[in-house]
C-alpha cells in the first residue's frame, strides 16, 4: 500500500549530512524498516521480540541509523548531487496483526548550501 | 453501493467439506482486510478467519487446519474453503469488512464497517 | 488469549432512559482496537463504534463509547425504540488476532 509523500519533515540537514525520519506509530512493536532511494534498498533495519518481551535489532542492509518508540532515522553523509532522488520509507508492521506494507516519501533536493559543512 | 453478498451455504454430513463465497462490490476490495464471522442459532458471533491485504491469514484455534481463507482481489471475491465440517459449525456465516491504516505516527483501525447478509451452513446427518 | 466479558447479560430498560454496557477484557487492548456492534434478530451485526469512542458513519450522536485498557463502555444517552437489540464489543490486532464478547441483550422493559 503505497500512502504517498509523508505529511511531516522528512529530511534534516546538518553538517553536509542528511537526517531522514521514517516515523511509524507507537503501538508497532515489531516491523522491518527499510530506506529506498527510487527503487534501491539503502537500509533496513528490523525489530522484532521474543520471549520475556527481549527486543532485537538487526540489519541486513546496514546503515547508520538511530531507533526510538516511533520513528527510525537514517543518516547519509557526505552528500553530493547524486543523492538526488526520491527516498522512501517502507514499513513493514508484523506486531500488531494484520501484517501491513505503507511507503511514504519525498524527493530529497540537493543545494550547494547543504553540500558542506552548513547546519541548517 | 457498498455490498457483501455470501453464497455456497447448505446442508453437509459431518466431515464434509463446503466452500463459501463473498462478492464485493462498490469498493476497492484489495485495500480491506477481510474477514469470516459466524453465528449459531441463539448465540453470539465467533471470529471465523481473517485475511489481510497482503495475503495473511488468520484463525482461531476452533478452524486452524480445517478452514482456509483466500481471496481473489481480481475478481473482487473472499472465500472459505471448509474441510473435516462438525455439528458444531452449523451456523450462519457472514463476511466483513475493516480497514486499518497506518500514516506517520498514526494507527487507525476501524472496525468491521461492512457486512453480508450471511449464508446458512448446517452440518447433520 | 483475551476473553470479553460483557456485562450484563440482559438489560431492561424503558424508551428514554440511559443504558450503559460494559466489556470487559482478561487482558489489556490498545483502545485502537476496540469496537461495538449492534444486531437486531434476523439481521446482519451493525459497526457503532470504532477505536473505542469513534462514532461509525450515519450512527446518532446519543451513541457514545468509552474506556481504556480492560474496561471499556458504551452508552446510549436516551434510548429510542429502535436501540432494543444485542450489542457486542469486539477487539482485534491481538491473540486471537480478533475476538467478541458475549453480548448484552437490550430490552425494553
Known amino acids: 500500500e503505497i500512502n504517498g509523500s509523508a505529511n511531516y519533515e522528512m529530511f534534516i540537514f546538518h553538517n553536509g549530512g542528511v537526517q531522514i525520519l521514517c516515523k511509524y506509530p507507537d503501538i508497532v512493536q515489531q516491523f522491518k524498516m527499510q530506506l529506498l532511494k527510487g527503487g534501491q534498498i539503502l537500509c533496513d533495519l528490523t525489530k522484532t521480540k521474543g520471549s520475556g518481551n527481549t527486543v532485537s535489532i538487526k540489519s541486513l542492509k546496514f546503515c547508520h541509523s538511530q531507533l526510538s518508540n516511533n520513528s527510525v532515522s537514517f543518516f547519509l553523509y557526505n552528500l553530493d548531487h547524486s543523492h538526488a532522488n526520491y527516498y522512501f520509507c517502507n514499513l513493514s508492521i508484523f506486531d500488531p496483526p494484520p501484517f501491513k506494507v505503507t511507503l511514504t516519501g519525498g524527493y530529497l533536493h540537493i543545494y550547494e548550501s547543504q553540500l558542506c559543512c552548513q547546519l541548517k | 453501493e457498498v455490498q457483501l453478498v455470501e453464497s455456497g451455504g447448505g446442508l453437509v454430513q459431518p466431515g464434509g467439506s463446503l466452500r463459501l463465497s463473498c462478492a464485493a462490490s462498490?469498493?476497492?476490495?484489495?485495500?480491506?482486510?477481510m474477514h469470516w464471522v459466524r453465528q449459531a442459532t441463539g448465540k453470539g458471533l465467533e471470529w471465523v478467519s481473517t485475511?489481510?491485504?497482503?495475503?495473511?491469514?488468520y484463525y482461531p484455534g476452533s478452524v486452524k487446519g480445517r478452514f482456509t481463507i483466500s481471496r481473489e482481489n481480481a475478481k473482487n471475491s473472499l472465500y472459505l474453503q471448509m474441510n473435516s465440517l462438525r455439528a458444531g459449525d452449523t451456523a450462519i456465516y457472514y463476511c466483513?469488512?475493516?480497514?486499518?491504516?497506518?500514516?506517520?505516527?498514526?494507527?487507525?483501525?476501524?472496525?468491521?464497517?461492512?457486512w453480508g447478509q450471511g449464508t446458512t451452513v448446517t452440518v447433520s446427518s | 488469549e483475551i476473553v470479553l466479558t460483557q456485562s450484563p447479560g440482559t438489560l431492561s430498560l424503558s424508551p428514554g432512559e440511559r443504558a450503559t454496557l460494559s466489556c470487559r477484557a482478561s487482558?489489556?487492548?490498545?483502545?485502537?482496537?476496540l469496537a461495538w456492534y449492534q444486531q437486531k434478530p434476523g439481521q446482519a451485526p451493525r459497526l457503532l463504534i470504532y477505536?473505542?469512542?469513534g462514532r461509525a458513519t450515519g450512527i446518532p450522536a446519543r451513541f457514545s463509547g468509552s474506556g481504556s485498557g480492560t474496561d471499556f463502555t458504551l452508552t446510549i444517552s436516551r434510548l429510542e425504540p429502535e436501540d432494543f437489540a444485542v450489542y457486542y464489543c469486539?477487539?482485534?490486532?491481538?491473540?486471537?488476532?480478533?475476538?467478541f464478547g458475549q453480548g448484552t441483550k437490550l430490552e425494553i422493559k
Open positions: 466483513a469488512r475493516s480497514s486499518t491504516v497506518v500514516s506517520g505516527y498514526r494507527y487507525d483501525y476501524y472496525g468491521m464497517d461492512v
Open positions: 462498490g469498493f476497492t476490495f484489495s485495500t480491506y482486510e
Open positions: 485475511i489481510g491485504t497482503a495475503g495473511d491469514t
Open positions: 487482558q489489556s487492548v490498545s483502545s485502537i482496537f
Open positions: 477505536g473505542a469512542s
Open positions: 469486539q477487539q482485534y490486532g491481538s491473540s486471537p488476532l480478533c475476538s
